[in-house]
Amino acid sequence: MKVLQEPTCVSDYMSISTCEWKMNGPTNCSTELRLLYQLVFLLSEAHTCIPENNGGAGCVCHLLMDDVVSADNYTLDLWAGQQLLWKGSFKPSEHVKPRAPGNLTVHTNVSDTLLLTWSNPYPPDNYLYNHLTYAVNIWSENDPADFRIYNVTYLEPSLRIAASTLKSGISYRARVRAWAQCYNTTWSEWSPSTKWHNSYREPFEQH
C-alpha cells in the first residue's frame, strides 16, 4: 500500500481543516488508514482523523480544530496499521479556503433596485470576519450567455444593482463566494443559489 498523491490540506480558519490524497489502488480509507495530527506546541497531543473515501483510490479527512491562529503548525502522519506511509506538516494560515457565505436572499421590493444580501460565514471574533470580500454570480436560466460576476470589495455582505441591468420577465439565479486577501486564500465554494423572477417597469419613452 502506497500513497500516490500526497495529502494536501486546506483550512476554513475556524474549526475544520480538510486533507485529501490518493492511494495507489482501491482503498477502504476508513478501515485501513488513520491520519494523526498534532499542533506543534508545548504539551499538545496527537489526535486521530478517520478518513472517508473520495472516489476509488481517493481519501478525504476532516481534521477538527478548536480554533486557528496564524502561528499554528501541525505535524501530519498517515498510518496504515503500524506502517507509516507519509509524514508531513501543515500550516493552516498558509492554506486557507474560507467557508461559503450563506442565507443569500434577493430583495425585489426596493423600487427598481435589486438588493442581494447574504451572511458572513464567520463569527465576529474570528480574524476573517472583517477581511472577507465577495464575488456575486448572477445568470439567466434561459440564456447561458447571460452570465455576470460582480466583485464586492467592501465589507458589507450586500450588493445593490438596478433591476434594469437584467432582462425583464425572466428568471435569474444568484450565488456568492468569498475570499480574504490578507491570507491570500483560495475562493470559497459557492453558496447555494437562489432564484427570482426579474420584472421591472420599463420607463416610458419620451417622443
Epitope: 495530527y37 499542533l39 506546541f41 508545548l42 504539551l43 499538545s44 497531543e45 496527537a46 489526535h47 477538527l64 480544530m65 478548536d66 480554533d67 491562529v69 496564524s70 502561528a71 499554528d72 480574524y127
Partner: antibody
Framework: EVQLVESGGGLEQPGGSLRLSCAGS????????MTWVRQAPGKGLEWVSS????????YYADSVKGRFTISRDNSKNTLYLQMNSLRAEDTAVYYC??????????????????WGQGTTVTVSS | DIVMTQSPLSLPVTPGEPASISCRSS???????????LDWYLQKSGQSPQLLIY???NRASGVPDRFSGSGSGTDFTLKISRVEAEDVGFYYC?????????FGQGTKLEIK
C-alpha cells in the same frame, strides 16, 4: 471542589530516592496536563517537570533531567514524581499544579489554576 | 531559557493606594494573536501560590477585580487599583510559552 493533595515527602540521604504523589479530584484528571513546581527554603518558585494529559509528553528542568521521572495513572487520578540520586539542592517544598487542557487540539491554557498544599522534601546526611 | 525580570523586588504600599509590578521577559511571550503566555501568582505567607492572572490579562476565577494584568510581547504589568491588607505576600510572574517554565524573582508587597 477541585483539589490536589500531595504526599510522599520526607527526609532522605543524598543519593537516595523518594516518590511524590499528587491525588486530583473534582475535575476530569486525564484531560489536563500536570506540573511540579518546587520552592527551596527562603527562595522563589522553580519549575521542575510537566506531563501531558495522556502521559505521552514529558518535560524536565535541566537540574533534574535524568534523575527525576514524572508519570501519571489516570485510572487513579494520580500524578507522580519519582526522585532518584537526590542532592542537597533538591531540598524544597514540592507543589503539584493543574496545567492546561490537553484533551483539546490546542492545549487550552488557564494558568496553573489549582495547586496542592505542598509536600516537604529534605535531603541531608 | 527565557529569563523573567521583575521590578521592584520590594513594594511598600499604603492601604487604599494603587500598586504596580513590572515583569520583563528576555524573549517575546506572544505565541500568536491574543496569546501571551504570561501569568501572575500571589504566594501569601505559609501558603501555596495562587493564580491571579493568566495569558497576560485574564483574571482567574474568584480573583477580585482590583487586580488587572496588561502587556504583550516582552513587557507586562500587574496593577492593584486599591491595595488591601490581605494582598500582602510575594508576587511572581511566570512564562509558560515554552519549557522550562520560568518565574520572576518575586516582588514582596508589604503594607506601610
Amino acid at each position: 471542589e477541585v483539589q490536589l493533595v500531595e504526599s510522599g515527602g520526607g527526609l532522605e540521604q543524598p543519593g537516595g530516592s523518594l516518590r511524590l504523589s499528587c491525588a486530583g479530584s473534582g475535575f476530569t484528571f486525564r484531560d489536563y496536563a500536570m506540573t511540579w513546581v518546587r520552592q527551596a527554603p527562603g527562595k522563589g518558585l522553580e519549575w521542575v517537570s510537566s506531563i501531558s494529559g495522556s502521559g505521552s509528553n514529558t518535560y524536565y528542568a535541566d537540574s533534574v533531567k535524568g534523575r527525576f521521572t514524572i508519570s501519571r495513572d489516570n485510572s487513579k487520578n494520580t500524578l507522580y514524581l519519582q526522585m532518584n540520586s537526590l542532592r542537597a539542592e533538591d531540598t524544597a517544598v514540592y507543589y503539584c499544579a493543574k496545567d492546561r487542557l490537553t484533551a483539546s487540539v490546542r492545549p487550552n491554557y488557564y494558568g496553573l489554576d489549582v495547586w496542592g498544599q505542598g509536600t516537604t522534601v529534605t535531603v541531608s546526611s | 531559557d527565557i529569563v523573567m525580570t521583575q521590578s521592584p523586588l520590594s513594594l511598600p504600599v499604603t492601604p487604599g493606594e494603587p500598586a504596580s509590578i513590572s515583569c520583563r521577559s528576555s524573549q517575546s511571550l506572544l505565541y500568536s494573536e491574543g496569546y501571551n503566555y504570561l501569568d501572575w501568582y500571589l504566594q501569601k505567607s505559609g501558603q501555596s501560590p495562587q493564580l491571579l492572572i493568566y495569558l497576560a490579562s485574564n483574571r482567574a476565577s474568584g480573583v477580585p477585580d482590583r487586580f488587572s494584568g496588561s502587556g504583550s510581547g516582552t513587557d507586562f504589568t500587574l496593577k492593584i487599583s486599591r491595595v488591601e491588607a490581605e494582598d500582602v505576600g510575594f508576587y511572581y510572574c511566570m512564562q509558560s510559552l515554552t519549557t522550562p517554565y520560568t518565574f520572576g524573582q518575586g516582588t514582596k508587597l508589604e503594607i506601610k
